[in-house]
Amino acid sequence: AQNITARIGEPLVLKCKGAPKKPPQRLEWKLNTGRTEAWKVLSPQGGGPWDSVARVLPNGSLFLPAVGIQDEGIFRCQAMNRNGKETKSNYRVRVYQIPGKPEIVDSASELTAGVPNKVGTCVSEGSYPAGTLSWHLDGKPLVPNEKGVSVKEQTRRHPETGLFTLQSELMVTPARGGDPRPTFSCSFSPGLPRHRALRTAPIQPRVWEPVPLEEVQLVVEPEGGAVAPGGTVTLTCEVPAQPSPQIHWMKDGVPLPLPPSPVLILPEIGPQDQGTYSCVATHSSHGPQESRAVSISIIEPGEEGPTAGSVGGSGLGTLA
C-alpha cells in the first residue's frame, strides 16, 4: 500500500488508477477506517451521508473534504477500464496535526544550587499523534534521571477533537559553582516524521549559591569556651558571604534580645552565662543559616577546662 500522510482539517484526493477519466466508470472504493467496522463501499453513483467524509469525484478519485483522525486507515479502489482490464489502488492514510508553539509555564526565576528545583512546565496543545516533549540546557538535550535531572510527564486527549495536550515538568539540581545563568528550553517533536521540532522561547533563571552551613564559623575566645568566674568570653561569627548578612545570637536555642552584631562579648562571666551559644546569619536573598553550637562553662581554679557546659542562667552579654 502507498503511504499517505495528511494534515487534519485539510482536503485529500486519492487517485483511482486505471479508471476512465469520465463516467460511465466501473469502479468502487472500499474504506476501512475509524469510521467503519469492516469495509464500507463507496461508488460513483453513491452520494449520501458519507459525502461529508468521502465522495467519489467524476474522474473516479476519492475526495475527502477535511481529513479527520477517524479517517486513518486503508483506502482501496478497484477500477475496470474500457477494455475490461482491472487495476487496483491501495492507500494507507495517516493523519497528523502540528500543535501550537510549546510554552514554558510556571517557570522559576531563581534556582538553588545543590538542591532539586522545579525549572518549569512545558505545555504543547493540539498535536496528533501525541509526539514528545524534550528539554534542553544551553542547547544540549537533558537526559532524565541523569545528573540530577528528573522529568514528570502527562498526556491528555481532548474528548471531542481527539488531539493531544502534553505536559512535561522539569526538575534539576544545579551543581555548585556551575553556570549562574543557565538557558533552558523545551521542544516538541512530532509523532510522524518529516516535520521539524518546535522549540519554546528559552528561560534563563539565576542560580543562587547558598553559603554552606560549615562556612558560618563560630570562633570562641578562650578556645573551648571554659573560663574562670569573672572572666570574659568573646564569640565571633564569621561569614564569608558578601554582602555581609545580619548576625543574631542564640542561647540554648532561644534568640537573645540583642541588636544584630558579628561579635558577642560575655564580660565577668557568672553561672547565669553558662549554656550553649550559636549565631544565625540571615541573608536578604535566602533563609537563615545557623552556626555550630558551642558550650560556655565556668571552671573553678585548679580544674581542667571541660568541653561541655552545664545549664546556665539568663545573664546577657555585651555586643562589641
Epitope: 467496522e37 464500507k40 449520501g48 451521508p49 458519507w50 467524509v53
Partner: antibody, heavy 119, light 107 residues
Framework: EVQLVESGGGLVQPGGSLRLSCAAS????????MTWVRQAPGKGLEWVAS????????YYPDSVKDRFTISRDNAKNSLYLQMNSLRAEDTAVYYC????????????WGQGTLVTVSS | DIQMTQSPSSLSASVGDRVTITCRAS??????VNWFQQKPGKAPRRLIY???NLADGVPSRFSGSRSGTDFTLTISSLQPEDFATYYC?????????FGGGTKVEIK
C-alpha cells in the same frame, strides 16, 4: 442558546407553492449539514431533504425530488425549503434539523411548522 | 432502500419497569443509528447517537446497544416523563430512514 426556528407554514391549495425558512442561532451554521424532516398528522417521521455545509450538494428522497428544493444562506444562518406542486399527502409538520451526514446524524431539531395542503 | 423495522409499535408499562425497543436494519448500516424521543406536539429529541452513545443531558437510564443489524434502546427504569413515542433513524445511506415508532404508554 443553540436553536432552530422554522417559519413559513400555512394553508396552501393543491398544486400551489410555499417556502419554509429556518433560522439557526448559537452555533457555527456553515460547519453543519442541514436537513428537513416532516411528520404527517398521527404518523411517523419522514426525511425530506438534506444539504451539505457549503450548499453545493443537495439530497432528496424520490417522493419530493423535482418538486422540493433545499437551499441555505450561510451569511444569514438560514435554511430554506421551496415546495412546489404541493399535494394533499405533503400535509405535515415540517421540522428543520441540524445534521444529516454520518458525522452528526440529526442532533438538534426546531419546533416545526405546519403545512396544510387542501382545497 | 434500507428498511428500519421497529418493534413493538406500542407497549404498556409501569413506572420502574425495564423497557426494550428494537430496530432491525434490512442491510448493514454500521454504527450510524440515532434514537429519538418525541412527546405529543413537540419536536423529536435525540437520546442516542452512533448506536450506543448517550447524548448530552440525557438521563443514564437510557442506553443503546447493537448486534449486527439489530439496534436496541433500553430504558432501565421507566419514569413518568418517559411516556412518549420513540424512533430510530439510520443515517448510513440515503434515503435516511426512520423506524415506524414505538409508543410507550402507561399500563
Amino acid at each position: 442558546e443553540v436553536q432552530l426556528v422554522e417559519s413559513g407554514g400555512g394553508l396552501v391549495q393543491p398544486g400551489g407553492s410555499l417556502r419554509l425558512s429556518c433560522a439557526a442561532s448559537g452555533f457555527t451554521f456553515n460547519n453543519y449539514w442541514m436537513t428537513w424532516v416532516r411528520q404527517a398528522p398521527g404518523k411517523g417521521l419522514e426525511w425530506v431533504a438534506s444539504i451539505d455545509n457549503s450548499g453545493d450538494n443537495t439530497y432528496y428522497p424520490d417522493s419530493v425530488k423535482d418538486r422540493f428544493t433545499i437551499s441555505r444562506d450561510n451569511a444569514k444562518n438560514s435554511l430554506y425549503l421551496q415546495m412546489n406542486s404541493l399535494r394533499a399527502e405533503d400535509t405535515a409538520v415540517y421540522y428543520c434539523a441540524r445534521g444529516g451526514d454520518i458525522k452528526v446524524g440529526l442532533d438538534l431539531w426546531g419546533q416545526g411548522t405546519l403545512v396544510t395542503v387542501s382545497s | 432502500d434500507i428498511q428500519m423495522t421497529q418493534s413493538p409499535s406500542s407497549l404498556s408499562a409501569s413506572v420502574g419497569d425495564r423497557v426494550t425497543i428494537t430496530c432491525r436494519a434490512s442491510q448493514d448500516v454500521g454504527i450510524y443509528v440515532n434514537w429519538f424521543q418525541q412527546k405529543p406536539g413537540k419536536a423529536p429529541r435525540r437520546l442516542i447517537y452512533r448506536a450506543t452513545n448517550l447524548a448530552d443531558g440525557v438521563p443514564s437510564r437510557f442506553s443503546g446497544s447493537r448486534s449486527g443489524t439489530d439496534f436496541t434502546l433500553t430504558i432501565s427504569s421507566l419514569q413518568p416523563e418517559d411516556f412518549a413515542t420513540y424512533y430510530c433513524l439510520e443515517f448510513d445511506e440515503h434515503p435516511l430512514t426512520f423506524g415506524g415508532g414505538t409508543k410507550v404508554e402507561i399500563k
